[in-house]
């Protein structure tokens, strides 16, 4: 057992350019504080829930108020130290959380107004009982600067706080084949006393006689990877040679709620149901109320006044959790048919939708000509979201109101001559040639090729195209 | 386009161990915040979820059935392996698999596709 | 346990009517999951937290609620809805279900 600790020195603009603006005004006082969130492991899949090595949460820091026209400055700090706690092993490897929460104070409707200025996160390698780790994280604009360390808590010493430690029973050495224990150098590592067997790499004890497993590892001794013991099946075949895989522990066994909590299994994690006057991941922070503003993400707090008195808090649509600090990325299944674009604006899901859709989830293919007038004869063709006019000749544009030139394409053959025409082009064609648009010579002997020319009009007259 | 198809023997004598595969794709299980579970019906009854593995080895069981479930992946093949042991009769039942995404960490978002299920008959 | 109780447990109605299929579970839950299943096939996603449609789902359908008491609404039933429906919890161990509500033509 041991406590991770977490101090903040300074939160403030970063360097260069784009300087944020100061969150709080003289119109709008506001005092800052701070989440810490911690999980063991390095990947940032680690199969816990968020904060399984546990979480704090800091004091509220001064009333601060921004002096009018100037740059924000570091922002006053809530005094002392975070502290989280952390019941078995230290890990060796973490991930944290670091967040920057701002509260109003001006007259607010229903309390305190809450909202996070900044959120920092981090992969690191710490040994416990180490010195303290300076770091420095940019979350856009704003820069947060803090130390850190993991110490354990006596007796338990070591880079994990899985030794334990005991005073020196004589003042001058310890007992036979014990060292001393660096760095109390006036006390003794104690006598094993974890059950005889148990892993040194994968076991530890908090009591005498006992073997607890680190994640991952199984058995009396914790000598088993997790699913992979041979076993036999307690109520299958009997056969010495059944191989057989045991479900690894669940993450109840064992409770890992304090303070009388109930544990149940969530579908990738678990879940405290902590007793009155305890909230935290596993129940272990007590004497919380309402006052301390422990709910997240503008969540709705109610609960006595008093430490002994219950508080719930009521999470607004996106958010769950017992402290509404889990996000629900509702968007993520892709709610917005036909390309249309999803927002999750937290009290509901909207979606934008690409021209031609519409509906709560643009399911509805709009009729693109509905309503669409395509001027001077043209007609309405759809697709694709959007409407287009096929124009009648002589006319162009999207809605078939500009007048088209109809010989701007030089649309007669063989050096035919164009002339427009108020129901289309005339091609004027040159000698040896017919057609509407010029295109057929004549042959020698007076027949045209294919087409015959209409009855009534020569071959070198004018041909009118309608 | 994403598919699972299970599959297994269709009768089990009482006392065996019953083993479905589950081969699905469209999806990876090794991608963040996919997983894989299973589901039965006996006929004329209810749906009862039994287990799930996600991505990253993460396994639930039901309550009721841990001591006879073992759920395991194989990424490489697509594929996910349920074992349930010492089968009765009230095992009877048609087992499907179906795919869960978590795009939270501790938040299903849907268990969206599903296979049209195995009918396992359980009688000696 | 998490017990998942529908109401009613079936229902007959005409094409065209309006459908409420309610959910209740006896302890709070964060999001309710509704499935439709028809004679003989697996089951298909309807909605999922609480209140989305899952792709290929009719806009007539709409889920709401929250806590302990979630609703299944279908706003103008097609002879194609007419199959049962399940809901669904997934808060806590074992991740229960809903005996079903069997909607039958009248």
């Known amino acids: 057992a041991g406590v991770f600790e977490l101090q903040i020195h300074s939160f403030g603009p970063g360097p260069g350019p784009g300087a944020p603006r100061s969150p709080c005004s003289a119109r709008l006082p506001c005092r800052l504080f701070f989440r810490v969130c911690l999980k063991p492991g390095l990947s940032e899949e680690a199969a816990e829930s968020p904060c399984a090595l546990g979480a704090a949460l800091s004091a509220r820091g001064p009333v601060y108020t921004e002096q009018p026209g100037a740059p924000a400055p570091d922002l006053p700090l809530p005094d002392g130290l975070l502290q989280v706690p952390f019941r078995d092993a230290w890990p060796g490897t973490f991930s944290f959380i670091i967040e920057t929460w701002r509260e109003e104070l001006g007259d607010q409707i229903g309390g305190p107004a809450w909202s996070l200025l900044a959120r920092v996160a981090g992969r690191r390698r710490l040994a416990a009982g180490g010195p303290w780790a300076r770091d420095i994280q940019r979350a856009g604009a704003w820069e947060l600067r803090f130390s850190y360390r993991a110490r354990c808590e006596p007796p338990a010493v070591g880079t994990a706080c899985t030794r334990l430690c005991r005073p020196r029973s004589a003042p001058s050495r310890c007992g036979p084949g014990l060292r001393p224990c660096a760095p109390l150098e006036d006390e003794c590592e104690a006598p094993l006393v974890c059950r005889a067997g148990c892993s040194p790499e994968h076991g530890f004890c908090e009591q005498p006689g006992e073997c607890r497993c680190l994640e991952g590892w199984t058995g009396p001794l914790c000598t088993v990877p997790v699913s992979t013991s041979s076993c036999l099946s307690p109520r299958g075949p009997s056969s010495a040679t059944t191989g057989c895989l045991v479900p690894g522990p669940g993450p109840c066994d064992g409770n890992p709620c304090a303070n009388g909590g109930s544990c149940s299994e969530t579908p990738r994690s678990f879940e405290c149901t902590c007793p009155r006057g305890f909230y935290g991941l596993r129940c272990e922070v007590s004497g919380v109320t309402c006052a301390d503003g422990p709910c997240f993400n503008g969540g709705l707090c109610v609960g006595g006044a008093d430490p002994d008195s219950a508080y719930i808090c009521h999470c607004p649509p996106g958010f769950q959790g017992s402290n509404c600090e889990k996000r629900v990325d509702r968007c993520s299944l892709q709610p917005c048919r036909n390309g249309g674009l999803c927002l999750d604006l937290g009290h509901a899901l909207r979606c934008r939708c690409r021209a031609g859709f519409a509906g709560p989830r643009c399911e509805h293919d709009l009729d693109d000509c509905a309503g669409r007038a395509c001027a001077n004869g043209g007609t309405c063709v759809e697709g694709g979201g959007a409407h287009r006019c096929s124009c009648a000749l002589g006319f162009g544009g999207r809605d078939c109101r500009e007048r088209a030139d109809p010989c701007a394409a030089r649309p007669c053959a063989h050096g035919g001559r164009c002339y427009a025409h108020f129901s289309g082009l005339v091609c004027a064609c040159a000698p040896g040639y017919m057609g509407a648009r010029c295109e057929f010579p004549v042959h020698p002997d007076g027949a045209s090729a294919l087409p015959a020319a209409p009855p009534g009009l020569r071959p070198g007259d004018p041909q009118r195209y309608l | 386009q994403i598919t699972l198809k299970e599959s297994g023997p269709t009768l089990v004598k009482p006392t065996q161990t019953l083993t479905l595969t589950c081969t699905f794709s469209?999806?990876?299980?090794?991608?963040?915040?996919?997983?894989v579970g299973w589901i039965r019906q006996p006929p004329g009854k209810a749906l009862e979820w039994l287990a799930h593995?996600?991505?990253?080895?993460?396994?639930r069981y039901s309550h009721s059935l841990k001591s006879r479930l073992t759920i395991t992946k194989d990424t490489s093949k697509n594929q996910v392996v349920l074992t349930m042991t010492n089968m009765d009769p009230v095992d009877t039942a048609t087992y499907y698999c179906a795919r869960i995404v978590s795009f939270d960490n501790d938040v299903v978002s849907a268990m969206d596709y599903w296979g049209q299920g195995t009918l396992v008959t359980v009688s000696s | 346990d998490i017990q998942m109780t529908q109401s009613p447990s079936s229902l007959s109605a005409s094409v065209g009517d309006r459908v409420t299929i309610t959910c209740s579970a006896s302890s709070s839950v964060s999001y309710m999951y509704w499935y439709q299943q028809k004679p003989g096939k697996a089951p298909k996603l309807l909605i999922y937290l609480t209140s989305n449609l899952a792709s290929g789902v009719p806009s007539r359908f709409s889920g709401s609620g929250s806590g302990t008491d979630f609703t299944l609404t279908i706003s103008s039933l097609q002879p194609e809805d007419f199959a049962t429906y399940y809901c669904q919890q997934w808060r806590s161990n074992p991740f229960t279900f809903g005996q079903g509500t069997k909607l039958e033509i009248k």
């Open positions: 469209g999806f990876s299980l090794s991608t963040s915040g996919m997983g």
């Open positions: 593995i996600w991505w990253d080895d993460v396994k």
